[in-house]
């Protein structure tokens, strides 16, 4: 008799998920000397232990604690770049500006970036058919809880000036429901963080508006100010030029506004 399987609304676990996590771990630890001590098999075992045999709508931050412990990593707290809805540009930036870090430049973020995973209650199987969707099924699913956990820890670690890259092409440049808006903003520590500086990335070639005056940015400023953290905002009118100038700051065209 075929066993009944829960059909979720979201895509299933990424193909070759165990191999991918293990391979990413090995690659990461090879090029980050400070993480060479990490045993990638133990990391995979802890990752697996967080969701295997558990109901995929009943995952808690506690489930991920063994993985968090193994993946503990110190990044310079004053070199943190947060982002919302503009991941690729944030990653292009830290690929050039090597002393700054997004969450996905840390081991745990790197391991899980772009992947989906879930298990099934009371079986050791990984579900490759479907996984819970955050909106349509449940919020306490393995992927959402993972990102909430690592994002909270990442924000808590930040100090001095924290930068956030925001997508100026979105209707809500700052979205209270994004991971940045719902988790990271509220876990910046006022006793450590002096300023949150937003970089609003423009999408249109001829877009010369001051998007720092956008109502959602004003809402972000209000939330941050109430937490006793200063707020500043910059328009990045030309993201392509911005990246070029990060690569070649001495270029004569880089003295003008970007």
């Amino acid at each position: 008799v075929p066993r009944w399987r829960q059909q979720w609304s979201g895509p299933g676990t990424t193909k070759r998920f165990p191999e991918t996590v293990l391979a990413r771990c090995v690659k990461y630890t090879e090029i980050h000397p400070e993480m060479r001590h990490v045993d990638c098999q133990s990391v995979w075992d802890a990752f697996k232990g967080a969701f295997i045999s558990k109901h995929p709508c009943n995952i808690t931050e506690e489930d991920y604690q063994p993985l968090m412990k193994l993946g503990t990593q110190t990044v310079p707290c004053n070199k943190i770049l947060l982002w919302s809805r503009i991941k690729d540009l944030a990653h292009q930036f830290t690929q050039v500006q090597r002393d700054m870090f997004t969450l996905e430049d840390t081991l745990l973020g790197y391991l899980a970036d772009d992947l989906t995973w879930c298990g099934e209650f009371n079986t050791s199987k990984i579900n490759y058919q479907s996984c819970p969707d955050w909106r349509k099924d449940c919020s306490n699913n393995p992927v959402s809880v993972f990102w909430k956990t690592v994002s909270r820890r990442f924000a808590e670690a930040a100090c001095d000036v924290v930068h956030v890259m925001l997508n100026g092409s979105r209707s809500k440049i700052f979205d209270k429901n994004s991971t940045f808006g719902s988790v990271e903003v509220h876990n910046l520590q006022p006793e450590k963080v002096q300023t949150l500086e937003a970089w609003v990335i423009h999408g249109g070639r001829e877009d010369s508006r001051d998007l720092c005056q956008d109502p959602t940015i004003k809402e972000l400023e209000s939330i941050i100010s109430k937490r006793n953290i200063q707020f500043s905002c910059k328009n990045i009118y030309r993201p392509d030029k911005f990246l070029q100038c990060v690569k070649n700051p001495e270029d004569s065209s880089c003295t003008s506004e970007i």
């Epitope: 193909k15 991918t20 391979a23 090029i31 292009q92 690929q95 790197y110």
Partner: nanobody, 125 residues
């Protein structure tokens, strides 16, 4: 959610050209962060890397297939394509498009971490 989807004819005649396209959704192929590639698996055999492309336009091919392979990208459609000339029955395989991990050159089946579902191509008259 990043997804890759292969498309193209499932049957190709010997000596003709096999053409496949990979459509990427949930991410951009022009971000300069990744290598995108093609891998195949003949029935009952292991995975074989065919080639990779980077958004700079650089392409890298398996030496054993280099003379017959072209990989190209169309960033406006967020697609990359495979052309394999002068096919024979030995080119019958499941063909996969895939993305390499950020920050690493990808030149073997184990170097890729996000995969399409695969499409079976049979070479037969």
């Amino acid at each position: 959610q990043l997804q890759l989807q292969e498309s193209g004819p499932g049957l190709v005649k010997p000596s003709e050209t096999l053409s496949l396209t990979c459509t990427v959704s949930g991410g951009s192929i022009s971000s300069s962060l990744f290598y995108w590639g093609w891998i195949r698996q003949p029935p009952g055999k292991g995975l074989e890397w065919i080639g990779s492309i980077h958004d700079s336009g650089s392409t890298y091919y398996n030496p054993s297939l280099k003379s017959r392979v072209t990989i190209s990208a169309d960033t406006s459609k967020n697609q990359f394509s495979l052309k394999l000339n002068s096919v024979t029955a030995t080119d019958t395989a499941e063909y996969y498009c895939a993305r390499g991990p950020r920050g690493f050159y990808s030149s073997g089946p184990d170097d890729f971490d996000i995969w399409g579902q695969g499409t079976l191509v049979t070479v037969s008259s």
